[in-house]
């Protein structure tokens, strides 16, 4: 049925963009101009079936399963949800709805190669002599830093920070062999006569 002007405000003269019955040249927000007439856009999650006329409103239909539209639109086809391809190391982080796309992320131990997260690569490990400054996430790689004097890392790891050298002094021992960035100190008894 045709609705009252109060219900369908795009039928106001103002909406048609002109005065004295002239066709509109611009429409309000969430409207579009077609055949010299302002029609309502379809809301997110719906696609356009038919444009409005002088007597009918815009006809919209909800997007199907695995489809979405995330804006007010006049699209005649919904977009397909992104596929998180496990062969590329991807998994679903957030399932798509009729109004949002699926968000993919990487499997544990992997991170995205780009902001769009279209594929994944294995997190890098920090070599001996380096510790993890920042553990990798689904979207960023491991950040490594050299172990400073007083710290060491003797493993290749994507998780381990540099470890402090053992304090021989607290064990009533002395350093028999100096530590390096890759090795801990070796403690031993004090040699009194050197």
């Amino acid at each position: 049925d045709y609705k009252d002007d109060d219900d369908k405000d795009y039928k106001d003269d103002d909406d048609k963009g002109g005065s004295g019955g002239e066709p509109p040249t611009a429409c309000r927000e969430k409207q579009y101009l077609i055949n010299s007439q302002c029609c309502s856009l379809c809301q997110p999650g719906q696609k356009l079936v038919s444009d409005c006329t002088e007597f009918t409103e815009t006809e919209c239909l909800p997007c199907g399963e695995s489809e979405f539209l995330d804006t007010w639109n006049r699209e005649t086809h919904c977009h397909q949800h992104k596929y998180c391809d496990p062969n590329l190391g991807l998994r679903v982080q957030q399932k798509g709805t009729s109004e949002t796309d699926t968000i993919c992320t990487c499997e544990e131990g992997w991170h995205c190669t780009s902001e769009a997260c279209e594929s994944c690569v294995l997190h890098r490990s920090c070599s001996p002599g380096f510790g993890v400054k920042q553990i990798a996430t689904g979207v960023s790689d491991t950040i490594c830093e050299p172990c400073p004097v007083g710290f060491f890392s003797n493993v290749s790891s994507a998780f381990e920070k540099c470890h402090p050298w053992t304090s021989c002094e607290t064990k009533d021992l002395v350093v028999q062999q100096a530590g390096t960035n890759k090795t801990d100190v070796v403690c031993g008894p004090q040699d009194r006569l050197r």
């Epitope: 830093e145 400073p148 004097v149 050298w165 350093v175 390096t180 100190v185 004090q190 040699d191 050197r194």
Partner: antibody, heavy 122, light 113 residues
Framework: QVQLQQSGAELMKPGASVKIPCKAT????????IEWVKQRPGHGLEWIGE????????NYNEKFKGKATFTADTSSNTAYMQLSSLTSEDSAVYYC???????????????WGQGTLVTVSA | DIVMSQSPSSLAVSVGEKVTMSCKSS????????????LAWYQQKPGQSPKLLIY???TRESGVPDRFTGSGSGTDFTLTISSVKAEDLAVYYC?????????FGGGTKLEIK
Amino acid sequence: QVQLQQSGAELMKPGASVKIPCKATGYTFSSYWIEWVKQRPGHGLEWIGEVLPGSGSTNYNEKFKGKATFTADTSSNTAYMQLSSLTSEDSAVYYCARPYYRYDVGAWFAYWGQGTLVTVSA
Amino acid sequence: DIVMSQSPSSLAVSVGEKVTMSCKSSQSLLYSGNQKNYLAWYQQKPGQSPKLLIYWASTRESGVPDRFTGSGSGTDFTLTISSVKAEDLAVYYCQQYYSYPYTFGGGTKLEIK
């Protein structure tokens, strides 16, 4: 208070060796690294290496391996640096120094000896 | 090896002036594990041994006048003397103790006009 006492000047012939002492007082000698630093005019300061007197453990700058040898005598609280096969490039002031902390946080040198001038000349 | 670069190599100022000198390292001296910068500053007056002024980039050594201030982080560091005195005539060296071998900058010679 902490003091590091070094010997005076040494005049050496090319090819000879010199052993520079650094006597420490005012702290537990065995527990702190002794650092050795070279200073040549126009060359700034160069770290040669370090020795921990309690164990004789050493760290050398690769550049000075084979040139410098560190030892320490805990009975006299004296650290030594021996320089071998002297050339004119070894003419410099050599300082011993001690870090503020014991051994595990990296070394800034809080205490310095007065330096030993080594001159190598035929 | 970590390379330490100081600038300027020399500068001449009048007593009472403010002085800043720069030290740059070829790699970061900031360790995230303790949020400390492994950098020290020394003063060497003519005919004397070097003297420690600053460690951990900004911690003033006991007894050092508060006109000496160290700042900076990562690879860029500055030593500032807020109001130079005649007795500050010296060469100033920075040193990294982040990794072996410990290395020094080439020094900045401060002369008094």
